[in-house]
């Protein structure tokens, strides 16, 4: 996983049952905050599942794992996290699970560290597109951000706000340009139907993507021509029917690729033939003798590595949630 | 004031290429996408593709792929589509537009217009 | 990919009058969609764009409106300017494309 993790170092505790006699005295600048757990060895805090509906603001200037956790933030403001003085060695941030439905512009300002952050399993309806970058200028300051976890942030369709959701998550990556560092992008169980154009071209240093679990149907607008760092991409449990020459080739064209395929509801027709052939040759598919046709019906479960071209032919009826372009 | 200025007419026998330049002015020219837009006679419009004069990434519409070219001179901000293998098809009215910012993938939309180039294909 | 099928294909009205252009899309484009208007020889003009959010510039007796895939084009009080072409685009994933467009001319 590559969530921030922390040696089981001793941690100190703000519970009440622990309060030590200090507690009464004002917040020293290295107290842990309540209803948190603190371990300045591991330079760690904890404040997990605790209900908080804000950041607390005596965060100690040591930390640099936060854990903030299954919490009820509903809404992180502009400079959520900006102290005097800054959290100057705050690297790894995950707010999983706390019920974000908005992430403001400038919330992760003043975080000059901040290597990874999760923002997993918060049903984020209003993402700002300055959130990653706290500035409208076309080229803000490069964040530091190196991984960014954003799995199952799609919120409830009734609170999407009418619009479309790729597109709020796309320009929050891409405004300012200050996420041209990224090198992990965890993008899974998003309910994605379409990837827009271009992104990957404007996030160049990424090593990782993962876009497992959404419902991608077609990627041939999507260019991977300038990844040439991607060491994986996670395409399992989508929507994908087939993959086109020009994704094959640029796929094959890159150095380091490790390509996972698996659960995809592939048509074995004659649009096939080019993938199979290429399936057959390349080393870049993991467990490609593990992907299977969902369709035509006659074509069901059938080994895609084990096909012809005499397998290939074209019946035009297609099952109706598969009529897309 | 935003202004795309595009090069003159075009009259060109089947099977040449051609290159139509669009100069953009007035904003910063890599924060947009510049779209190319097809219109024949008397018909409707047909969006030909995409780019991102920052990258220099381009997207085709698949309809187009192998007819079109497009490209930008980021020093004179201005962008080119280039045409080939022309065909009477290919005679019309070519029209610049600016598109999203380049961060906005929704906001797809052409504000501003060049004036056209009138591309005839003829023996 | 998405079509665009827009109506009437032409149509004569007054000055003075109300008339509404219709577009439908193949699919669900949230309110992606946008509505220029063409003078013979010239560029389009942006309108509208988000299915009802009108162009700075553009008069208010034009307005836009959505009911779930299928989208209008209000003018109100046509004017002598207004008669032209207009078309219909969505802008939600690529390739965008246009509906045929509607002449609207003068009875």
């Known amino acids: 996983s590559s969530s921030p993790t922390s040696s089981a170092s001793s941690f100190s505790s703000s519970a009440p049952f622990l309060a030590s006699a200090v507690s009464a005295q004002p917040p020293l600048p290295d107290q842990c905050p309540a209803l948190c757990e603190c371990s300045e060895a591991a330079r760690t805090v904890k404040c997990v599942n605790r209900n908080l509906t804000e950041v607390p603001t005596d965060l100690p200037a040591y930390v640099r794992n936060l854990f903030l956790t299954g919490n009820q933030l509903a809404v992180l403001p502009a400079g959520a996290f900006a102290r005097r003085p800054p959290l100057a060695e705050l690297a790894a941030l995950n707010l999983s699970g706390s019920r974000l439905d908005e992430v403001r512009a400038g919330a992760f300002e003043h975080l000059p560290s901040l290597r990874q952050l999760d923002l997993s399993h918060n049903p984020l309806a209003d993402l700002s597109p300055f959130a990653f970058s706290g500035s409208n200028a076309s080229v803000s300051a490069p964040s530091p951000l190196v991984e960014l976890i954003l799995n199952h942030i799609v919120p409830p369709e009734d609170e999407r706000q009418n619009r479309s959701f790729e597109g709020m998550v796309v320009a929050a990556l891409l405004a300012g340009r200050a996420l041209q560092g990224l090198r992990r992008l965890e993008l899974a169980s998003n309910h994605f139907l379409y990837l827009p154009r271009d992104v990957l071209a404007q996030l160049p240093s990424l090593r990782h993507l993962d876009l497992s679990n959404n419902s991608l149907v077609s990627l041939t607008y999507v260019s991977f021509r300038n990844l040439t760092h991607l060491e994986s991409l996670h395409l399992e449990d989508n929507a994908l029917k087939v993959l086109h020459n020009g994704t094959l080739a640029e796929l094959q064209g890159l150095p380091h690729i490790r390509v996972f395929l698996d659960n995809n509801p592939w048509v074995c027709d004659c649009h096939m033939a080019d993938m199979v052939t290429w399936l057959k040759e390349t080393e870049v598919v993991q467990g490609k003798d593990r992907l299977t046709c969902a369709y035509p019906e006659k074509m069901r479960n059938r080994v895609l590595l084990e096909l012809n071209s005499a397998d290939l032919d074209c019946d035009p009826i297609l099952p109706p949630s598969l009529q897309t372009s | 004031e935003v202004q795309l200025q595009q090069s003159g007419p075009e009259l060109v026998k089947p099977g040449a290429s051609v290159k139509i330049s669009c100069k953009a002015s007035?904003?910063?020219?890599?924060?947009?996408?510049m779209n190319w837009v097809k219109q024949s006679h008397g018909k409707s419009l047909e969006w030909i593709g995409d780019?991102?004069?920052?990258?220099?990434?381009?997207t085709n519409n698949q309809k187009f792929k192998g007819k079109a070219t497009l490209t930008v001179d980021k020093s004179s901000s201005t962008a080119y589509i280039e045409l080939r293998s022309l065909t009477s098809e290919d005679s019309a009215v070519y029209f610049c537009?600016?598109?999203?910012?380049?961060?906005?993938?929704?906001?797809?939309?052409?504000?501003?217009w060049g004036q056209g180039t009138t591309l005839t294909v003829s023996s | 990919d998405i079509q665009m099928t827009q109506s009437p294909a032409s149509l004569s009205a007054s000055v003075g009058e109300t008339v509404t252009i219709t577009c439908r899309a193949s699919e669900n484009i949230y309110s992606y969609l946008a509505w220029y208007q063409q003078k013979q020889g010239k560029s389009p003009q942006l309108l509208v764009y988000?299915?009802?959010s009108l162009t700075e510039g553009v008069p208010s007796r034009f307005s836009g409106s959505r009911s779930g895939t299928q989208f209008s084009l209000k003018i109100n009080s046509l004017q002598p300017e207004d008669f032209g072409s207009y078309y219909c685009?969505?802008?939600?994933?690529?390739?965008?494309?246009f509906g045929g467009g509607t002449k609207l001319e003068i009875k």
């Open positions: 537009a600016r598109g999203s910012i380049y961060y906005d993938s929704t906001a797809n939309y052409f504000d501003y």
């Open positions: 007035g904003y910063t020219f890599t924060d947009y996408y």
């Open positions: 780019i991102n004069p920052y990258s220099g990434g381009a």
């Open positions: 685009q969505h802008h939600y994933v690529t390739p965008w494309t």
């Open positions: 988000n299915a009802k």
